[in-house]
Interface confidence: medium
């Protein structure tokens, strides 16, 4: 038989025995001559190197390019393929020789002890046990142990071939520790060598690359990529890498098995690719493929190689961020750069440091955004190598849903005298300002809070029949004034007022404010009484340590038994917007107070005096009077607020400034405190006196120096003082330029 591709110029070597298969007896001599057209060599079984002592290869005496192979006294082990070939080509002629040796029908392997067969537990896979025969037509079976089992060729999936060995589905012998072939000749049994069965796995669970993504390097740096394959037990792995610059001289590949915990159902293999100094041509996709023979899994990552350090903002970097109070705000610094830049955040020019409310890193995170977080945030990226800086400004706008200032004054609201004109107010703070404030009303009796009616926190009113104030049929005549805008506590607020032209009917009024991020509402209980009337003397909110009198005036012909009470500290729980139980129905919550009675021609006046009012005196005061005829009780409630004494503070700072001669300087100094502080100005620690050039306005809040002169230069101090102390701020005014000579000089 001939193998290899025919060549244009060469014929195949010619063998002296023109057969594919030759059968000879043991102990005889095998001699085959091979002739050709150039240098020849022989290969024979068991020894592919040509160093076997018994085998003799000689040059023919009768011609060039001719060699004879001789084996005297052949044995069964000499069975196999004999090949004559041209050196350094694929052109060859082969003959298969059977040496019939009935004493050893199986050809022994080179190592005469045992062999190893590797199998997988795959139903579809077969395994070949290489027990080759020196006789072609033997009856061969396969023995597996332990427990012992015998497998006989079935003409289908189990077979024996003298040239190949015993073929059997691998799962049939996967239980076994060892197998061997057995042949019966004339009732004698002959056994091949033992083969140890090794069950190998093939499943690869995953292949992981590390780093897995975002690999960036600069020219000359070292790239190290680790590829880890996790497999079932008894698996062998071959790694294969694909990368952009395959001809890299600094490339290094190291493969090794990783230790896993004992009892683990898994094996780990690691392949490490190292390129010592990357170049631009190393940029690209790196793929690691792990193969177990039956299965291949791969993973890829992109490696970016930069020519030089750089930093830039990514296209997705925001310039405006909008948020609502209380939300968590995240402003990521989106950048492109190598190496990763240092990131610094500034707010209105001041560096931001991380704390429990704000995290200033790759992402600026404000945990619970508040109004004061509104402003311009600058992020500065610095390339740590080149020191190149890039900056970007992000404007943060914080929206505030409508907040109604008076809503915090939850109390059994004041009663209103029958027939009087009253103004109800809702002061709304919202960002952006509310796009509308609407008023609604309903009759008090339609919504009486009777004990029998269940009132929940979420729905404090048993009835929700709110009517628009335009429809005041059956109620009080109403007029809604145009919204006013006022600066209150340094905030721009919207004030909506509802004027009740004549207080005839007890009702509930609701104002509702809406802006783009939410809504707010306030319910006002407008209780109309024909009973007593409360006034406050002096008519203002007292400050701590001031004296105040509460006057209760009632018509003597109608009322008797005037009494002052204070509402206890823990009345029935009142929820936001909930209507309280009428105080006259619940005297248990009242504390009786000492008061002085005065009378004039028509009225009784009961005066309750508070000397040196304290914060503890705040609360709801009730005047109770009894109808002389019906004996029905009438209650009027008045809320008293005592303002806390606050030491002076000055908001804002005076700035040092430089001005040219002849120009004007205008500065303001806003002070707060209770009692309100007096503001005074000093220059170089001496009281500043008003003259034609120095003007003080708005209770000394604003200082104007007109047509400044050189002598106006100096240290200016604004001082705000009250009985509780002083606060001051200072600034240095520098006056530049030469003084012009006047005609007088």
């Amino acid at each position: 038989a001939s193998v290899g591709l025919p060549s244009v110029s060469l014929d195949l070597p010619r063998l002296s025995i023109q057969k594919d298969i030759l059968t000879i007896k043991a102990n005889t001599t095998l001699q085959i001559t091979c002739r050709g057209q150039r240098d020849l060599d022989w290969l024979w079984p068991n020894n592919q190197s040509g160093s076997e002592q018994r085998v003799e290869v000689t040059e023919c005496s009768d011609g060039l390019f001719c060699k004879t192979l001789t084996i005297p006294k052949v044995i069964g082990n000499d069975t196999g393929a004999y090949k004559c070939f041209y050196r350094e080509t694929d052109l060859a002629s082969v003959i298969y020789v059977y040496v019939q040796d009935y004493r050893s029908p199986f050809i022994a392997s080179v190592s005469d002890q045992h062999g190893v067969v590797y199998i997988t537990e795959n139903k579809n896979k077969t395994v070949v046990i290489p027990c080759l025969g020196s006789i072609s037509n033997l009856n061969v079976s396969l023995c597996a142990r332990y427990p012992e089992k015998r497998f006989v060729p079935d003409g289908n999936r189990i077979s024996w071939d003298s040239k190949k060995g015993f073929t059997i589905p691998s799962y049939m012998i996967s239980y076994a520790g060892m197998v061997f072939c057995e042949a019966k000749i004339n009732d004698e049994s002959y056994q091949s060598i033992m083969y140890i069965v090794v069950v190998v796995g093939y499943r690869i669970y995953d292949v992981v690359l590390s780093p897995s993504h975002g690999i960036e390097l600069s020219v000359g740096e070292k790239l190290v990529l680790n590829c880890t394959a996790r497999t079932e037990l008894n698996v062998g792995i071959d790694f294969n890498w694909e990368y952009p610059s395959s001809k890299h001289q600094h490339k290094k590949l190291v493969n090794r098995d990783l230790k896993t915990q004992s009892g683990s159902e898994m094996k780990k293999f690691l392949s490490t690719l190292t390129i010592d100094g990357v170049t631009r041509s190393d940029q690209g996709l790196y793929t690691c493929a792990a193969s177990s023979g039956l299965m291949t899994k791969k993973n890829s990552t992109f490696v970016r190689v930069h020519e030089k350090p750089f930093v830039a903002f990514g296209s997705g970097m925001e310039s405006l961020v909008e948020a609502t109070v209380g939300e968590r705000v995240r402003i990521p610094a989106k950048y492109l750069g190598y190496p990763p830049p240092e990131i610094k955040w500034y707010k209105n020019g001041i560096p931001l440091e991380s704390n429990h409310t704000i995290k200033a890193g790759h992402v600026l995170t404000i945990m619970e955004v508040s109004e004061r977080d509104t402003g311009n945030y600058t992020v500065i990226l610095t390339n740590p190598i080149s020191k190149e800086k890039q900056s970007h400004v992000v404007s943060l706008v914080v929206y505030v849903p409508p907040q109604i200032g008076e809503k915090s004054l939850i109390s059994p609201v004041d009663s209103y005298q029958y027939g009087t004109t009253q103004t109800l107010t809702c002061t709304v703070y919202a960002i952006p300002p509310p796009h509308h404030i609407h008023w609604y009303w309903q009759l008090e009796e339609e919504c009486a809070n009777e004990p029998s009616q269940a009132v929940s926190v979420t729905n404090p009113y048993p009835c929700e029949e709110w009517r628009s104030v335009e429809d005041f049929q059956g109620g009080n005549k109403i007029e809604v004034n145009k919204n006013q805008f006022a600066l209150i506590e340094g905030k721009n607020k919207t004030v909506s007022t509802l004027v009740i032209q004549a207080a005839n009917v007890s009702a509930l009024y609701k104002c509702e404010a809406v802006n783009k991020v939410g809504r707010g509402e306030r319910v006002i209980s407008f209780h109309v009484t024909r009973g007593p009337e409360i006034t406050l003397q002096p008519d203002m909110q007292p400050t701590e340590q001031e004296s105040v009198s509460l006057w209760c005036t009632a018509d003597r012909s109608t009322f008797e038994n005037l009494t002052w009470y204070k509402l206890g500290p823990q009345p029935l729980p009142i929820h936001v917007g909930e209507l309280p139980t009428p105080v006259c129905k619940n005297l248990d919550t009242l504390w009786k107070l000492n008061a002085t009675m005065f009378s004039n021609s028509t009225n009784d006046i009961l005066i309750m005096e508070l000397k040196n009012a304290s914060l503890q005196d705040q609360g709801d005061y009730v005047c109770l009077a009894q109808d002389r005829k019906t004996k029905k009780r009438h209650c009027v409630v008045r809320q008293l607020t005592v303002l806390e004494r606050v030491a002076p503070t000055i908001t804002g700072n005076l700035e040092n400034q430089t001005t040219s001669i002849g120009e004007s300087i205008e500065v303001s100094c806003t002070a707060s405190g209770n009692p309100p502080p007096q503001i005074m100005w000093f220059k170089d620690n001496e009281t500043l006196v008003e003259d034609s050039g120095i003007v003080l306005k708005d209770g000394n809040r604003n200082l104007t120096i007109r047509r400044v002169r050189k002598e106006d230069e100096g240290l200016y101090t604004c001082q705000a003082c009250s009985v509780l102390g002083c606060a001051k701020v200072e600034a240095f005014f520098i006056i530049e330029g030469a003084q012009e000579k006047t005609n007088l000089e």
């Epitope: 350090p309 240092e342 610094k344 890193g361 190598i385």
Partner: antibody, heavy 126, light 110 residues
Framework: QMQLVQSGAEVKKPGSSVKVSCEAS????????ISWVRQAPGQGLEWMGR????????NYAQTFQGRVTITADKSTSTMFMELSSLRSEDTAVYYC???????????????????WGQGTMVTVSS | QPVLTQPPSASGTPGQRVTIFCSGS????????VNWYHHLPGTAPKLLIY???QRPSGVPDRFSGSKSGTSASLAISGLQSADEADYYC???????????FGGGTKLTVL
């Protein structure tokens, strides 16, 4: 741990040039910047310039602009500082120093001379 | 003339706390981090504080740094005789595109 090893002391005449070397051993040359800093007798530390070996780019202090050349040989992991038109005021100890490149706190980059050479004394005298 | 300003000398007795100040401008300390170096004559300078207030491993916690606006300070508590040395502050300057040092402060332990 990387070490910076500098060449030995030099004595030079005014108007001549000096070339001091600084070899990095025991670490990756990588993308660290290497600066040169000098200290004249009785004076403080003075920064001269820096080179980023991996990119071969250098920048110099204005005081030395045009007189100093800082180069790097990537194959031998060696930096060189050459100062020309020497004058007696250039008598000083010349140091090479590595700018560290470690991250810390997630967003801040540690920027400091964490490894210094042992120094090279250059004397300029007629 | 050094770009960063340091007092030429400082002193203290053993156990005392000493503070060395370093003043700069918005282009250096104002926009970059400050480092402090310890220098003994005849040896290479050694990094003492980096990134305003961070200590490299091996530097005792007696040394602390801080920065506010365009100035920085180095505080040494529990002063020891071994602390006698020159101390330098340094920062990157964006305008000069380079490192700038202070003139150095010679610390004497009395």
């Amino acid at each position: 741990q990387m070490q910076l090893v500098q060449s030995g002391a030099e004595v030079k005449k005014p108007g001549s040039s000096v070339k001091v070397s600084c070899e990095a051993s025991g670490g990756t040359f990588s993308s660290f910047a290497i600066s040169w800093v000098r200290q004249a007798p009785g004076q403080g530390l003075e920064w001269m310039g820096r080179v980023i070996p991996v990119f071969g780019t250098a920048n110099y202090a204005q005081t030395f602009q045009g007189r100093v050349t800082i180069t790097a040989d990537k194959s031998t992991s060696t930096m060189f500082m050459e100062l020309s038109s020497l004058r007696s005021e250039d008598t000083a100890v010349y140091y090479c120093a590595r700018e560290s490149g470690d991250y810390y706190d997630g967003s801040r980059y540690v920027d400091a001379f964490d490894i210094w050479g042992q120094g090279t004394m250059v004397t300029v005298s007629s | 003339q050094p770009v960063l300003t340091q007092p030429p000398s400082a002193s203290g007795t053993p156990g005392q706390r000493v503070t060395i100040f370093c003043s700069g401008s918005t282009s250096n300390i104002g926009s970059n981090t400050v480092n402090w170096y310890h220098h003994l004559p005849g040896t290479a300078p050694k990094l003492l504080i980096y990134s305003n207030n961070q200590r490299p491993s091996g530097v005792p916690d007696r040394f602390s740094g801080s920065k506010s606006g365009t100035s920085a300070s180095l505080a040494i508590s529990g002063l020891q005789s071994a602390d006698e040395a020159d101390y330098y502050c340094a920062a990157w300057d964006d305008n000069l595109n380079g490192w700038v040092f202070g003139g150095g402060t010679k610390l004497t332990v009395l």
